[in-house]
């Protein structure tokens, strides 16, 4: 039960006090007791419950009423059963007893009131009225946890607007209200109560720029909502009528959890005694609700796809046809960004990452816009953000970014368990340098901080700076699987490729050509590739880099070797000893459920079939996956990217609710 106020009683004059239902009020009977009195007894109206604790226990008088010694060991507390119909309608009488004097009486007139701030602290999607209880002041994780949840109102319900809904202090319509969390103030008081008392709704100054509260006046129509708390307003006096009354508020978060904001926001209603005009107002009671701002959550390849994004650029019609066919097979919506909007920037994966935010009453997809800001920079904000599609960005918006700030360098694993630690939403993966140096690249700290602050997908830092482009999607991917952990990790593997080529040579196919059918490309015989010592040295280096990540992933994701599939792939070291794919990088694939769009490797044709394609199919088809090899050579591969780099996917949110986990 929540702590109420302390009431001091005195025999000199009656005391008037307010007692809020659900609180425990302390009664000080000692400090004003007559000097020659040594004990006291208590009588109350039926609506008041008094509890007296003393060590050792008191003796009962023969009349049946108990007396207690007047000493500091006595604790008197009271609660009220119901709200008062009129001011002071409940009474407590303290009788002081002494050996030589008649009893001295002290009177306490109590007004019971109900004042409670309620929100969906049980996370059911409904607001249940709660009396003032301690539990509302703490937010706890886990299936038995409690505490309310706020969404950052980061979508744009008004198509005419260019701003997010949370950037204005208006409520557009009932759709906009659904992005907010309902909070209800319930009051039950005597009719004249608020002539002598006031209620103030407030938020800490340190949190006022993270939240906005709208009051619904007369009904719940959006046009009748007005801002009462927000970035410019940490407190608001409420005009509350006497009697029984409910007042609804709609709360929106304005900021995601981040370095200096753990995501918790406390809204408090304070009851002030304003009866003494000549004196300052005194706080009589406070009730609070703690909200946690819903984190931005990424979705792994194992989540069902809902929408595919791709760019139309000069001469990529065939690529578009292949992606369109794949999306149709996977029953996905397809969004094509036209040439005039992408400004010759085809790298859809690098521009954005689509995740979601979730509260018990609402789930919202949210696009995380990378700070790379090349030709596609307007696409997330102009074409993706919209009604029920949110937007967030981090990092410097002009300059100061590296290639590792592109979101081909941002992936997430499927759900994993590492030892005793569960990651039911998976873990974020991003690439970094091995150690900082004058020319090393790393993901911008603002991005790293944001990802860590979401708490629910604890990030793992991988090593990707060894690559020319430097993205984790150049050496890893995840595909769904029907067994084991429900997925496989795919890793690019020079070792596996050399093994395959050696086997082919041993079988007499050493003259088979890589890059057959590619115009203006030096075709390479298997035997020449195998005998090229420089290329071998380069791939030995690449293998070491990938193996470093392999061990890191096994440790951080709790994987066994049998959870990993090696995809044959060769690399070459280019300028400044940075690696890039020697032939189209097959691990850089588009995963749409069981349908995989894999870069066509143009490997050696043996018995009428590309041996690289055949090998990959033999590895993935037993998992129930369908492999489609997409020709991306001229339009993507020679520009240092592949199918995954050129596409993006919105996926179905997890069925697991983030608040049920324990980070």
């Amino acid at each position: 039960m929540a702590q109420g106020t302390l009431i001091r009683v005195t025999p000199e004059q009656p005391t008037h006090a307010v007692c809020v239902l659900g609180t425990l009020t302390q009664l000080d009977v000692c400090s004003s007791a007559p000097e020659d009195c040594t004990s006291f007894s208590v009588n109350t109206s039926p609506g008041v419950v008094v509890d007296i604790a003393h060590s050792p226990p008191a003796k009962k008088k023969s009349t049946g009423s108990s007396t207690w010694p007047l000493d500091p060991g006595v604790e008197v507390t009271l609660t009220m059963k119901a709200a008062s119909g009129s001011t002071g309608d409940q009474k407590v009488q303290i009788s002081y007893h002494g050996p030589k004097t008649p009893p001295v009486k002290a009177l306490l007139y109590l007004t019971g009131v109900e004042i409670s701030l309620s929100a969906d602290i049980t996370r059911t999607g409904k607001v249940k009225p709660t009396r003032a209880v301690e539990d509302k002041r703490t937010w706890t994780w886990g299936p038995c946890g409690q505490g309310a949840i706020l969404l950052v109102n980061c979508d744009r319900d008004n198509p005419e607007s260019s701003a997010m809904d949370c950037e204005d202090d208006e409520v557009l319509d009932s759709k906009d209200l659904k992005d907010m969390s309902l909070m209800t103030l319930s009051t039950k008081t005597p009719q004249d109560f608020f002539t002598r008392h006031t209620l103030v709704l407030h938020v800490a100054r340190s949190e006022m720029d993270k939240v906005r509260v709208f009051q619904a006046t007369r009904g719940r129509l959006s046009s009748r909502c007005r801002v009462v708390l927000g970035p410019k307003q940490p407190s608001h006096y409420l005009m509350v009528p006497g009697g029984k009354h409910n007042m609804d508020f709609y709360v929106e978060a304005l900021a995601f959890p981040d370095t200096n904001f753990p995501g918790l926001i406390t809204l408090t209603v304070s009851m002030l005694d304003t009866s003494k005009l000549e004196l300052p107002e005194a706080v009589v009671f406070q009730d609070s609700v703690v909200f946690r701002v819903a984190p931005w959550i990424m979705t792994p390849n194992t989540q069902p796809p809902q929408e595919v994004y791709v760019c139309s650029i000069f001469e990529n019609e065939d690529f578009l046809k292949s992606v369109t066919a794949l999306a149709m097979q996977a029953r996905c919506k397809l969004t094509i960004c036209p040439e005039e909007e992408n400004m010759d920037d085809q790298w859809m994966q690098d521009e954005m990452e689509i995740g979601y935010i979730q509260a018990p009453h609402k789930t919202l997809p949210v696009v995380f816009d990378s700070p790379r800001n090349r030709g596609l920079k307007e696409f997330p904000i102009k074409r993706v953000m919209g009604p029920d599609f949110g937007y967030v960005t981090r990092g410097p918006q002009t300059g100061g970014v590296s290639g590792l700030d592109s979101f081909g360098n941002l992936e997430v694993s499927p759900p994993v368990t590492v030892g005793d630690k569960e990651y039911p939403l998976g873990r974020i993966l991003f690439g970094d340098s091995c150690y900082p140096s004058s020319d090393s690249r790393e993901m911008h700290q603002a991005l790293q901080d944001f990802l860590s602050a979401q708490q629910v997908q604890a990030p793992v830092k991988l090593y990707s700076d060894w690559l020319t482009v430097g993205h984790v999607d150049e050496f890893l991917s995840f595909v769904p699987a029907p067994d084991r952990k429900g997925f496989r990790l795919l890793l690019a593997s020079p070792r596996s490729c050399y093994k395959l080529f050696q086997e082919q040579q041993n079988e007499g196919h050493g003259d088979a050509l890589l890059f057959q059918g590619i115009k203006k490309k030096n075709q390479q015989k298997i035997k020449n590739i195998l005998s090229n010592t420089t290329l071998r040295e380069h791939n030995s280096f690449v293998e070491r880099c990938i193996d470093w990540n392999r061990e890191l992933l096994k440790r951080e994701l709790g994987l066994a070797e049998s959870d990993i599939i090696d995809i044959p792939q060769l690399f070459k070291l280019k300028e400044f000893s940075k690696a890039e794919a020697f032939f189209p990088n097959m691990v850089n694939m588009l995963v749409l459920g069981k349908h995989l769009g894999i870069p066509k490797p143009f490997g050696p044709i043996i018995n009428g079939r590309c041996c690289l394609e055949e090998k990959v199919c033999s590895l993935l088809e037993p998992l129930g996956l369908h492999c489609t090899f997409i020709n991306d050579f001229y339009t993507y591969h020679i520009r240092h990217g592949e199918v995954h780099c050129g596409t993006n996917v919105r996926r179905k949110p997890f069925s697991f609710k983030w608040w049920n986990m324990v980070p």
Partner: antibody, heavy 128, light 111 residues
Amino acid sequence: QVQLVESGGGLVKPGGSLRLSCAASGSTLSDYFVSWIRQAPGKGLEWVSFISSANTFTYYADSVRGRFTISRDNAKNSVYLQMNSLRAEDTAVYYCSSANDDVDDIVAPGRGYYMDVWGRGTLVTVSS
Amino acid sequence: QSALTQPRSVSGSPGQSVTISCTGTSGDVGRYNHVSWYQQHPGKAPKLIIYNVYERPSGVPDRFSGSKSGNTASLTISGLQAEDEADYYCSSHSRSSTPVLFGGGTKLTVL
């Protein structure tokens, strides 16, 4: 063959800033490694900065690191050198140079380390 | 002071051969086969004449040749001609924090 033209040079006070541009014609600059090289009056060549064709990594000489920033805008077929906190010793003719990033090379061709196409240069004078 | 060391000047008569040396360390010239040579006439931009130690871009006469031994690279110009009179610079990739180094330049005079 790509042609390069530098612009943006001029007189600037110590501590000031300038932004040099290198505009390409005749080919798509996105397929090229681009470097800036400078030459102080009567002195030798000094390599300043490099940006990869994939626009994913950059390198700088110790003498300019932290003060200069190289960037590229493939849509504008241009590369830029933003020079801040300029010093008297930065006075020089600044050349933009490039080398084609040929994907056909089986192993490292070294094209990022040499410059086969040069612009005519733009003069930067840092003086009070 | 330049990171790669070249002679300040060399000279030769028309028809003769001259060799310009470029000495570095085991962290640049000695480590990588990424040595290039540039020719610069007064008031003009430099021109690439040798790359990857000994390769010639198209259009460069075969009178120009490059080689390397240990930490020293060399440019040899045979059958000197009057138009060869210019400044010559060597360059190398380096594993130092400045990844491309130039020599101080050599003035070739054709007598």
